[in-house]
């Protein structure tokens, strides 16, 4: 049994890091493998993660961690029974993938303005809480070409757009994702999408 693609990990910078790797053949990850992780810190304890299958030869492990700080560094050992297959390290602050925003809501009752709001996925005491910026994706279910991205570079988890920038009388969907420049993170996954019917009063033509 050999490791074909070494584990790569990303952290949500809160409580979970996710590591993925590939073996050289079909593997029952949960029965055959264990991923050990230990914070390189005074008197830390070692922990065992039981991986799940992620495709035939792929494995994924969700490492539970205490509140992460930028200096944290973990040793990682991949074991098959009593055989050490791979040894590495992981610094969560250097591989951050934020949690996806949640509770995306489209408010359509504000005159002819669409107000999109969502929840910051972090609690206020987490460093990322005040460092997230967002991208909102809006698209038409009827017209694949009607696809747009709005970058939200301020901290407030909301976006206002004129309803008239979208076509009237058709259904749209929106989703939102987050990233943090301070840690040069990757983008989060997209939030679940929400759907609404866009309708607004056309302005009277002036003669």
């Amino acid at each position: 049994m050999k490791v074909l693609q070494e584990p790569t990990c990303v952290s949500d910078y809160m409580s979970i890091s996710t590591c993925e790797w590939k073996m050289n053949g079909p593997t029952n990850c949960s029965t055959e493998l264990r991923l050990l992780y230990q914070l390189v810190f005074l008197l830390s304890e070692a922990h065992t993660c039981i991986p799940e299958n992620n495709g035939g030869a792929g494995c994924v492990c969700h490492l539970l961690m205490d509140d992460v700080v930028s200096a944290d560094n973990y040793t990682l050992d991949l074991w098959a029974g009593q055989q050490l297959l791979w040894k590495g390290s992981f610094k969560p602050s250097e591989h951050v993938k934020p949690r996806a925003p949640g509770n995306l809501t489209v408010h359509t009752n504000v005159s002819d303005t669409l107000l999109l709001t969502w929840s910051n996925p972090y609690p206020p005491d987490n460093y990322l809480y005040n460092h997230l910026t967002y991208a909102v994706n809006i698209w038409s279910e009827n017209d694949p070409a009607d696809f747009r991205i709005y970058n939200v570079t301020y901290l407030e988890p909301s976006l206002r757009i004129a309803a008239s920038t979208l076509k009237s009388g058709i259904s749209y969907r929106a989703r939102v994702r987050a990233w943090a420049q301070c840690y040069n993170t990757t983008w989060s996954e997209w939030s679940p999408s929400t759907k609404w019917h866009n309708s607004y009063r056309e302005p009277f033509e002036q003669h």
């Epitope: 050990l36 230990q38 005074l42 008197l43 830390s44 304890e45 070692a46 050992d77 050490l84």
Partner: antibody
Framework: EVQLVESGGGLVQPGGSLRLSCAAS????????MSWVRQAPGKGLEWVAI????????YYPDSVKGRFTISRDNAKNSLYLQMNSLRAEDTAVYYC??????????WGQGTTVTVSS | DIQMTQSPSSLSASVGDRVTITCKAS??????LAWYQQKPGKAPKLLIS???SLETGVPSRFSGSGSGRDFTLTISSLQPEDFATYYC?????????FGGGTKVEIK
């Protein structure tokens, strides 16, 4: 070369106090956690106190908690162990040791503490 | 606390002998184990960490093996300076604990 030199051991009566010192050299003292490990006559090794590099975190096993206090002076490259309410079972050679997160990578020669009436 | 049991507690051997010391843990440690050497009246010295990784400057006649609960320290060809007491230590869970020691004496 890493050097750790202990001092302050001696004979003390039960219930008495003693303060051990350890002078460190040959490495950046403030970057390392330090510890005191003891060895009772004819017995094995037991760590009794650990302190982080900055001195902000300390750890003790139940056997000495509330009686022993570890401290450090990074400006003087020195480690200390204040031992109060000493008991006969605290009789041992006390080693100052540098801690590499999980194991002890350099040790001093030790200083003997005898608790007896 | 995790209990570390070393065996034998003492052994007699001659220069050139192959010596094996075992350390058994009360629970699975994977490879979170260190070995130390202590000569009479001297400070302990770290020999091996991670069950198998020799520290810098330690002669290659020393080797560590094992994982899980059972670990071994082997001296392939005993030298006069190797007569000492050897200790194992686990760092899987705090409080980190030591074995009782194995004294290697001259036959």
């Amino acid at each position: 070369e890493v050097q750790l030199v202990e001092s302050g051991g001696g004979l003390v009566q039960p219930g008495g106090s003693l303060r051990l010192s350890c002078a460190a050299s040959g490495f950046t003292f403030s970057s390392y956690a330090m510890s005191w490990v003891r060895q009772a006559p004819g017995k094995g090794l037991e760590w009794v106190a650990i302190i982080s590099g900055g001195g902000d975190s300390t750890y003790y096993p139940d056997s000495v908690k509330g009686r022993f206090t570890i401290s450090r002076d990074n400006a003087k490259n020195s480690l200390y162990l204040q031992m109060n309410s000493l008991r006969a079972e605290d009789t041992a050679v006390y080693y100052c040791a540098r801690l590499h997160y999980w194991y002890f990578d350099f040790w001093g020669q030790g200083t003997t503490v005898t608790v007896s009436s | 606390d995790i209990q570390m049991t070393q065996s034998p507690s003492s052994l007699s051997a001659s220069v050139g002998d192959r010596v094996t010391i075992t350390c058994k843990a009360s629970e699975d440690l994977y490879n979170r184990l260190a070995w130390y050497q202590q000569k009479p009246g001297k400070a302990p010295k770290l020999l091996i960490s991670g069950a198998t990784s020799l520290e810098t400057g330690v002669p290659s006649r020393f080797s560590g093996s094992g994982s899980g609960r059972d670990f071994t320290l082997t001296i392939s060809s005993l030298q006069p300076e190797d007569f000492a007491t050897y200790y194992c230590q686990q760092y899987w869970r705090n409080p980190y604990t030591f074995g009782g020691g194995t004294k290697v004496e001259i036959k």
